[in-house]
Interface confidence: medium
C-alpha cells in the first residue's frame, strides 16, 4: 500500500499586504478517509486556519470544491493579507474518527508579507 503524501509544492510565497495568498496542497491518495485542516505554525501553539468540517473561516476559501467526489486538491486562498498573517502554513491530513487523528503534515509553505506599494 502506497504511503499517503501531503504535497505543498511551494516552500515560500510572498504577497503584498491587502492582497490574497494562494497556498497549494494536494494529497496523493483518497485513503484513508478523513479531513484536511490548515494550520499556521507547528506544535501546540499552531493556529487553526481552515477546517472544512466546522467553524466559520471568512477570509479563507477552498480553491477547488472540497466536497466534490475524488477531490485531492485542498489548496486555499486567504484574502486581505496583513503582516500578522506572516508565518509557515501547514496542510494536515487527519483520519476520520472520534476524535479525528492527525496522520500526516505537508512540509509547510512560508508566507511573507510585503508592504503595499504606495
Amino acid at each position: 500500500e502506497e504511503e499517503l503524501q501531503v504535497i505543498q509544492p511551494e516552500k515560500s510565497v510572498s504577497v503584498a499586504a491587502g492582497d490574497s495568498a494562494t497556498l497549494n496542497c494536494t494529497v496523493s491518495s483518497l485513503i484513508p478517509v478523513g479531513p484536511i485542516q490548515w494550520f499556521r505554525g507547528a506544535g501546540p501553539g499552531r493556529e487553526l486556519i481552515y477546517n472544512l468540517k466546522e467553524g466559520h473561516f471568512p477570509r479563507v476559501t477552498a480553491v477547488s470544491d472540497p466536497t466534490k467526489r475524488n477531490n485531492m486538491d485542498f489548496s486555499i486562498r486567504i484574502s486581505n493579507i496583513t503582516p500578522a498573517d506572516a508565518g509557515t502554513y501547514y496542510c494536515v491530513k487527519f483520519r476520520k474518527g472520534s476524535p479525528d487523528v492527525e496522520l500526516k503534515s505537508g512540509a509547510g509553505t512560508e508566507l511573507s508579507v510585503r508592504a503595499k506599494p504606495s
Partner: antibody, heavy 119, light 108 residues
Framework: DVQLVESGGGVVRPGESLRLSCAAS????????MNWVRQAPGEGLEWVSR????????DYAESVKGRFTISRDNSENTLYLQMNSLRAEDTAVYYC????????????WGLGALVTVSS | ETVLTQSPATLSVSPGERATLSCRAS??????LAWHQQKPGQAPRLLIY???NRATGIPDRFSGSGSGTDFTLTISSLQTEDSAVYYC??????????FGGGTKVEIK
C-alpha cells in the same frame, strides 16, 4: 445565538488569586481564538490576553505577563483566566471576547465579571 | 506598537443630526479597523469591521469609512439609543490588540 457568560469575579486582597471562567455556547468553540479584555472603572478597554483555538498558543499584555494565565477546555466550551499576585490596578470588569478568525476583531463579547482588588 | 487616537473625546449631538467620530492610527493598519459601541452598564458590541462593513443586525445609520491611518464612524441620524461610548480597535499588527481611548456620544 452566540453566548459568552463570565463568572468567578469578586473582591480579593492585593497579592491574592482569582480564577475567571467564561462559558461559551452557540458556536464551534474549538475553532476560534478567544480573548480577555478588561475595563477599569471609568476607563477604556484594555486587551489582556489571547489563546489560540487549540489552546497551545497564548499572548499577554505586558501589564499582566507572568501573573495571569489564560487557558481553555474545548471539551467543556470554557475559557479561563487565572489571576495571581493581584494588584489594586487590576480592578476592572473582565470581558471574554470571541475572535472572528485567527487574525481578527472581536465579534462577540460576554457581559463581564467584576474583579475588585482592595485591602 | 500602533497607537489609536480617537477624537473628539465627547460629542454632543441633537437627535436626528449627524455624528462624525474619528480614529487615527500612528501607522497604517490597512483596512483592519473595527468599531465597538458600549452603552452605560453594558458590554461592548461590534458595529463595524474591516473599516466599512456593518456587523450583523447593525442599523444602516451606522457607517464606517477610511483606510491606512484615518478612519471615521458616521451615525447619519442620531437616535436617543445611540448614546454610548464608541471604541475603535486595530487588528493589523498584534499582539497586543489595541483600542482607541473612546468617544462619548451624548444626546443634546
Amino acid at each position: 445565538d452566540v453566548q459568552l457568560v463570565e463568572s468567578g469575579g469578586g473582591v480579593v486582597r492585593p497579592g491574592e488569586s482569582l480564577r475567571l471562567s467564561c462559558a461559551a455556547s452557540g458556536f464551534s468553540f474549538s475553532s476560534y481564538a478567544m480573548n480577555w479584555v478588561r475595563q477599569a472603572p471609568g476607563e477604556g478597554l484594555e486587551w489582556v490576553s489571547r489563546i489560540n483555538s487549540g489552546g497551545g498558543g497564548t499572548d499577554y499584555a505586558e501589564s499582566v505577563k507572568g501573573r495571569f494565565t489564560i487557558s481553555r477546555d474545548n471539551s467543556e466550551n470554557t475559557l479561563y483566566l487565572q489571576m495571581n499576585s493581584l494588584r489594586a490596578e487590576d480592578t476592572a470588569v473582565y470581558y471574554c471576547a470571541k475572535q472572528y478568525d485567527w487574525n481578527g476583531f472581536f465579534d462577540y463579547w460576554g457581559l463581564g465579571a467584576l474583579v475588585t482588588v482592595s485591602s | 506598537e500602533t497607537v489609536l487616537t480617537q477624537s473628539p473625546a465627547t460629542l454632543s449631538v441633537s437627535p436626528g443630526e449627524r455624528a462624525t467620530l474619528s480614529c487615527r492610527a500612528s501607522q497604517t493598519v490597512g483596512s483592519k479597523l473595527a468599531w465597538h459601541q458600549q452603552k452605560p452598564g453594558q458590554a461592548p458590541r461590534l458595529l463595524i469591521y474591516d473599516a466599512t462593513n456593518r456587523a450583523t443586525g447593525i442599523p444602516d445609520r451606522f457607517s464606517g469609512s477610511g483606510s491606512g491611518t484615518d478612519f471615521t464612524l458616521t451615525i447619519s441620524s442620531l437616535q436617543t439609543e445611540d448614546s454610548a461610548v464608541y471604541y475603535c480597535q486595530q487588528y493589523y499588527y498584534w499582539p497586543p490588540y489595541r483600542f482607541g481611548g473612546g468617544t462619548k456620544v451624548e444626546i443634546k
